[in-house]
């Protein structure tokens, strides 16, 4: 029961996540102008990984796509190719976890074979919140960078009577949202991994018992019956935990992230 | 088609109060940032108040800051300016105008004459 | 604030001449977020409210007529008639729209020589 409780939960806070992280890649607001100790603008200023946007207090917004490839920064790119990373793992782990859940039958699947599904969705859901939370990370990191540089260059240039104000660029809430839904990933895949300990399936191994009847010896070996029958005084439960092996080859085998740039 | 009509304007003493309201129709009301610009006799045109379309934040000039209240009724489609402190520079048409893309103001009203005088 | 300068203050073109009005900011209205200027020009004559004319600097209003443009970047702007009509006469006012407060340029009168 605490298994099945401890998958399903896991499952749940995987796809909460993973939605996150959907949510989070399509969201413009992943910078946003900093407006502390700036000049009132009628405009304001936010970008995302795929276009940027600005509001004028008109009512008015308009957004423009980064319609170049190449001419993008490399950083941007990497972050782009984090995201989608970390959503097809993510997509992929889903899909393989509905057919792990212990409450759903499918045919006459072995535990087992739920069991290394389980194993095998928690892993992607780790790296699927660990690609999130790095993509997440790394256009943060960029930020400051950026922000400090447009600091220092916010009173320089110009000169004279004429002044050009710098834009300068903050956390957006994509951020935040992402940073939370790679970090639900991460424990959904974490959640996963255990209950896959518990989903092994339990196997009786039981020596031989023999029985002496009246001038012949017939020897039954019940071994192979799941449940304990109360064979002898010698019952040996043994928990069998098939999986892990595999795994890292299934993960590996996922298309790698050039592959959705 | 886009309706601005400005009304009460009048004759006010220096220190008075006066409420201007625009009526507004043949848009969503509620979208758009509306301004106030005023012009005054034989003079130029000054901006007065703005109150952003959506998140309705209110902008003003110095010269009217503390004095003059820019809000709007959005059931009512109504745009109002109340103005206390009164001064004779405060005379002028007053014109109600919706805002569009580059904070532009496309549309305009016929405007609304107050008069600052003891 | 944001010093709206219009030159000259009064400008006499003879019909069919083409008519330039500059407009100078103390502060660039470039905004980076979209490289786009915040600068209109409006038309108004007597006894009327402003008409838009330009916005962004350099973006005709519908229904504006094609001999009115737009041109400039940062801190100066200019608005130029191509071939004067009659009905142009009216005084012409430049504005930021990027810093509040806005602020209009004093105007220019442009009349028939």
């Known amino acids: 029961m605490a298994v099945t409780a401890c998958q399903g939960l896991g499952f749940v806070v995987s796809l909460i996540g993973i939605a996150g992280i959907i949510a989070a890649t399509c969201m413009d607001q992943w910078s946003t102008q900093d407006l502390y100790n700036n000049p009132v603008t009628a405009v304001f200023n936010y970008q995302g990984l795929w276009r940027s946007c600005v509001r004028e207090s008109s009512g008015f917004t308009e957004c423009r796509g980064y319609f170049t490839l190449l001419g993008l920064p490399a950083m941007l790119q990497a972050v782009r190719a984090l995201m989608i990373v970390g959503i097809v793992l993510g997509a992929i782990g889903l899909l393989v976890s509905i057919f792990a859940l212990k409450c759903i039958r499918i045919g006459s699947m072995e535990d087992s074979a739920k069991a290394n599904m389980t194993l095998t969705s928690g892993i992607m859901f780790i790296v699927s919140g660990l690609c999130a939370i790095a993509g997440v990370s790394v256009f943060a990191n960029m930020l400051v960078t950026n922000f400090w540089m447009s600091t220092a260059n916010m009173y320089t240039g110009m000169g004279g009577m004429v002044q050009t104000v710098q834009t300068r660029y903050t956390f957006g809430a994509a951020l935040f949202v992402g940073w939370v839904a790679g970090g639900l990933t991460l424990i959904g895949g974490v959640m996963m991994c255990i209950a896959c300990r518990g989903l092994a399936p339990e196997e009786t191994n039981y020596k031989a018992v023999s029985y002496h009847a009246s001038g012949h010896s017939v020897a039954y070996k019940p071994g192979g019956f799941k449940a304990s029958t109360g064979f002898g005084s010698n019952t040996k439960n043994k928990k069998i935990y098939d999986g892990g092996a595999r795994t890292e080859d299934e993960v590996q085998s996922y298309p790698s992230k050039h592959d959705y740039v | 088609e886009v309706q601005l009509v400005e009304s009460g304007g009048g004759l006010v003493k220096p220190g008075g109060s006066l409420r201007l309201s625009c009526a507004a129709s043949?848009?969503?009301?509620?979208?758009?940032?509306m301004s106030w610009v005023r012009q005054a006799p034989g003079k130029g045109l000054e901006w007065v108040s703005t109150?952003?379309?959506?998140?309705?934040?209110?902008y003003y000039p110095d010269s009217v800051k503390g004095r003059f209240t820019i809000s709007r009724d959005i059931a009512k489609n109504s745009l109002y300016l109340q103005m206390n402190s009164l001064r004779a520079e405060d005379t002028a048409v007053y014109y109600c105008?919706?805002?569009?893309?580059?904070?532009?103001?496309?549309?305009w009203g016929q405007g609304t004459l107050v008069t600052v005088s003891s | 604030d944001i010093v709206m300068t219009q030159s000259p203050d009064s400008l006499a073109v003879s019909l069919g001449e083409r008519a330039t009005i500059n407009c100078k900011s103390s502060?660039?209205?470039?905004?980076?977020?979209?490289?786009?200027?915040?600068l209109t020009w409006y038309q108004q004559k007597p006894g009327q409210p402003p008409k838009l004319l330009i916005y962004?600097?350099?973006t005709r209003e519908s229904g504006v007529p094609d001999r009115f443009s737009g041109s400039g970047s940062g801190t100066d702007f200019t608005l130029t008639i191509s071939s004067l009509q009659a009905e142009d006469v009216a005084v012409y006012y430049c504005?930021?729209?990027?810093?509040?407060?806005?602020?209009f340029g004093q105007g220019t009168k442009l009349e028939i020589k």
């Open positions: 105008a919706r805002s569009y893309n580059a904070n532009s103001l496309p549309y």
């Open positions: 043949g848009f969503t009301f509620s979208s758009y940032g």
């Open positions: 109150i952003s379309g959506g998140d309705s934040y209110t």
């Open positions: 502060q660039s209205l470039l905004n980076s977020g979209n490289q786009r200027n915040y």
């Open positions: 962004w600097a350099s």
């Open positions: 504005q930021n729209n990027y810093f509040y407060p806005f602020t």
